[in-house]
């Protein structure tokens, strides 16, 4: 058993049929010695008396808020949560496996630039009685500070008959150095509590590996005289790291017909313009990627040829 936060404790249980469970001793936080009784949740049934209560925790029915009282007055509370271990593996019932970039990916993180600010998100089908708390650091043995905000419901999507909820959190490395080579990874730890179930999820990454620029901005077409060709121009996104001479992007320009089956013409360039043939009813799209490190491409910015 360990303390998650004040008056909230996590009991770690090997979860299999007829498991013996864990013996837990609760102590009432009071100078009183006599006349103390204990109850669980909303029940008025007295579970025991005295300053300590010893219980055998085997299942979710044994978890919950234990309260010690004296003469009708509440003295203190202890909330017990369960963390299940099945076949030596901690349960991952609360979050959905996003399966990208690999199986057992519960947390996904992205950064728009090298400023040390990043966003992580996760998915669940659970809509109520759910809380998250997030901690992060650079390295684990001698951790350097990363400050994270509160996890917030950020999207809701229908998947078949179910609703899927996405939660996001923003974090900022306290002393980020955008141009420095990273040697220690960022660690992100998420505590998830659903009703009386506790789970924890972790992710470890370098900022350089989670970079995904915003799409190029101000995408414009300029027709070339007496030609089907157009000059496409764009700018670096506002959110990209500066100076651009050091933090450089490369771009992919794509001409896509109305039908997805039509052949796509693609041009790659380090410049912020390109000349392409604009077909009728086609659209021109541009996306960006770090020029010197193959992290993710941005989403596409698009304009119609017409």
């Amino acid at each position: 058993i360990w303390e998650l936060k004040k008056d909230v404790y996590v009991v770690e249980l090997d979860w299999y049929p007829d498991a013996p469970g864990e013996m837990v001793v609760l102590t009432c936080d009071t100078p009183e010695e006599d006349g103390i009784t204990w109850t669980l949740d909303q029940s008025s049934e007295v579970l025991g008396s005295g300053k300590t209560l010893t219980i055998q925790v085997k299942e979710f029915g044994d978890a919950g808020q234990y309260t010690c009282h004296k003469g009708g007055e509440v003295l203190s509370h202890s909330l017990l949560l369960l963390h299940k271990k099945e076949d030596g593996i901690w349960s991952t019932d609360i979050l959905k496996d996003q399966k990208e970039p690999k199986n057992k990916t519960f947390l996904r993180c992205e950064a728009k630039n090298y400023s040390g600010r990043f966003t992580c998100w996760w998915l669940t089908t659970i809509s109520t009685d759910l809380t998250f708390s997030v901690k992060s650091s650079r390295g684990s043995s001698d951790p350097q500070g990363v400050t994270c905000g509160a996890a917030t419901l950020s999207a809701e999507r229908v998947r078949g008959d179910n609703k899927e909820y996405e939660y996001s959190v923003e974090c900022q490395e306290d002393s980020a150095c955008p141009a420095a080579e990273e040697s220690l990874p960022i660690e992100v730890m998420v505590d998830a509590v659903h009703k009386l179930k506790y789970e924890n999820y972790t992710s470890s990454f370098f900022i350089r590996d989670i970079i995904k620029p915003d799409p190029p901005k101000n995408l414009q077409l300029k027709p070339l005289k007496n030609s089907r060709q157009v000059e496409v121009s764009w700018e670096y996104p506002d959110t990209w790291s500066t100076p651009h001479s050091y933090f450089s992007l490369t771009f992919c320009v794509q001409v896509q017909g109305k039908s997805k089956r039509e052949k796509k013409d693609r041009v790659f360039t380090d410049k912020t313009s390109a000349t392409v043939i604009c077909r009728k009813n086609a659209s021109i799209s541009v996306r960006a990627q770090d020029r010197y490190y193959s992290s993710s491409w941005s989403e596409w910015a698009s304009v119609p040829c017409s």
Epitope: K112, R117, T119, G149, T152, L153, S154, A155, E156, S168, E170, T239
Partner: nanobody, 115 residues
Framework: EVQLVESGGGLVQPGGSLRLSCAAS????????MYWVRQAPGKELEWVST????????RYADSVKGRFTISRDNAKNTLYLQMNSLKPEDTSLYYC????????RGQGTQVTVSS
């Protein structure tokens, strides 16, 4: 008292653009994640987009991704939704909201996409 006042809706042809605005007051706007939701006649309220309090994180429904852009100006307490390449199926009453479920939302602004 929390107030959210949307504007910028109107009638537009398919492929056209509109920019919606939402003026917020009565709460600390710069501390709040904000949302756009919409409701078509006879349909359920639908989440469209989300932006974090800093503006760094944005999220979009699959149906609008690549066409709509959410942004905010914390100095002006204003939320925006730039809508490009509009389609007839985007026709809805659009609300800005302080929660994704739309319980804390404004009166809405009507967007009609029709030729």
């Amino acid at each position: 008292e929390v107030q959210l006042v949307e504007s910028g809706g109107g009638l537009v042809q398919p492929g056209g653009s509109l920019r919606l605005s939402c003026a917020a007051s009565g709460f600390t706007f710069s501390d709040s994640w904000m949302y756009w939701v919409r409701q078509a006649p006879g349909k359920e309220l639908e989440w469209v987009s989300t932006i974090s309090n800093s503006g760094f994180t944005t999220r979009y429904a699959d149906s609008v991704k690549g066409r709509f852009t959410i942004s905010r100006d914390n100095a002006k307490n204003t939320l925006y939704l730039q809508m490009n390449s509009l389609k007839p199926e985007d026709t809805s009453l659009y609300y800005c909201a302080r929660d994704l479920g739309g319980a804390l939302r404004g009166q809405g602004t009507q967007v009609t996409v029709s030729s």
